[in-house]
């Protein structure tokens, strides 16, 4: 079946922008004016998984690259990378579980937590021009929560 | 609380076009779909399309494309849908009804229905 | 296009009795299956979402629940104003389907 898909863009809690930095990594940084057209939009997959109350699963994949936020073990550590896909097969309904994201919302804040690492969230720096990561710490210095944005598609 | 008041009933001449409204308050407007749904009388729901105000999204039954047009004004909260090519089988009750962005929340409230009469 | 059949078609039962109405999916819909109420003349009013979740207002009679491809709607213990007709739809793929739909009558 067709993925469901929507496209927006994220920012932090601290109304922080994600651009890309480099061929395979975002950060986070305060973007104004025209700027703002940097950012990275983000095509948002609405996927399978594991049933919950509060969760929903999604797969975020850049729009029109075929580049999906994925989540690996990198030296015994929960790791937030970009991962390139055959675009033939991608977006699809059942995503490899690295792919897997539970966005949980209240009160219109977003976290995005790794459904392979359960309490690994994608995570920002309070510093700007920081990389994205995932954080294994809610409610810390680092920033878990975040607001969409729709991008006409 | 959560309000979807659709337009008035309208009767229409084979052919012609019917523009039905749905002016919803209560929750931010952006971030549900607007379902559309038809009932024609003593008949089932049928799904016609929706549409997400926030990104213009619009995703139809393909037996509506062409026969249906739906859109969305984010400065009045209101969704519309037009009808074109006006014919007896046309003539229903056509309901809106809301779902959060992520589908979650499956058709939680309805509009009071705008019937719909085709005749010559 | 994904059949969503629904059975029975009609049933009488009375005050008091508990009811079972099932929807049978033609494949998988990811749990994306909602039941709605209607009443002549009204709008339909949605009762439970993703198979078992209650709608905010909605009297714990109703339940719903899965096995398979198989979804049902159970009220414990009809009450005078259950008497209507109740719809199961799918929301999983385009074009979202309902089913033909359950006049609830009373015996």
């Known amino acids: 079946a067709p993925v469901r898909s929507l496209n927006c863009t994220l920012r932090d809690s601290q109304q922080k922008s994600l651009v890309m930095s480099g061929p395979y990594e975002l950060k986070a940084l305060h973007l104004q004016g025209q700027d703002m057209e940097q950012q990275v939009v983000f095509s948002m997959s609405f996927v399978q998984g594991e049933e919950s109350n509060d969760k929903i699963p999604v797969a975020l994949g850049l729009k029109e690259k075929n580049l999906y936020l994925s989540c690996v073990l990198k030296d015994d550590k929960p790791t937030l990378q970009l991962e390139s896909v055959d675009p033939k097969n991608y977006p699809k309904k059942k995503m490899e579980k690295r792919f897997v994201f539970n966005k949980i919302e209240i009160n219109n804040k977003l976290e995005f937590e790794s459904a392979q690492f359960p309490n690994w969230y994608i995570s920002t720096s309070q510093a700007e021009n920081m990389p994205v990561f995932l954080g294994g710490t809610k409610g810390g210095q680092d920033i878990t929560d975040f607001t969409m944005q729709f991008v006409s598609s | 609380q959560v309000q979807l008041v659709q337009s008035g009933a309208e009767v229409k001449k084979p052919g012609a076009s019917v523009k039905v409204s749905c002016k919803v308050s209560?929750?931010?407007?952006?971030?549900?779909?607007i379902e559309w749904v038809r009932q024609a009388p003593g008949k089932g729901l049928e799904w016609i399309g929706e549409?997400?105000?926030?990104?213009?999204?619009?995703n139809y039954n393909e037996k509506f494309k062409g026969k249906a047009t739906i859109t969305a004004d984010t400065s009045t909260d209101t969704a519309y849908m037009e009808l074109s090519s006006l014919r007896s089988e046309d003539t229903a009750v056509y309901y809106c009804?809301?779902?959060?962005?992520?589908?979650?929340?499956?058709?939680?409230?309805w509009g009071q229905g705008t019937l719909v009469t085709v005749s010559s | 296009d994904i059949q969503m059949t629904q059975s029975p078609s009609s049933l009488s039962a009375s005050v008091g009795d508990r009811v079972t109405i099932t929807c049978k999916a033609s494949?998988?819909?990811?749990?994306?299956l909602s039941w709605f109420q209607q009443k002549p003349g009204k709008a339909p009013k949605s009762l439970i979402y993703?198979?078992?979740r209650l709608v905010d207002g909605v009297p714990s009679r109703f339940s719903g629940s899965a096995s398979g491809t198989d979804y049902t709607l159970t009220i414990s213990s009809l009450q005078p104003e259950d008497f209507a007709t109740y719809y199961c739809?799918?929301?999983?793929?385009?074009?979202?389907?309902f089913g033909q739909g359950t006049k609830l009558e009373i015996k």
């Open positions: 739809l799918q929301y999983d793929e385009f074009p979202y389907t």
């Open positions: 494949q998988d819909i990811d749990r994306y």
């Open positions: 009804s809301t779902i959060y962005y992520d589908y979650d929340q499956g058709f939680t409230y």
């Open positions: 209560g929750y931010t407007f952006s971030r549900y779909w």
């Open positions: 993703r198979v078992k």
């Open positions: 549409i997400l105000p926030g990104d213009g999204n619009i």
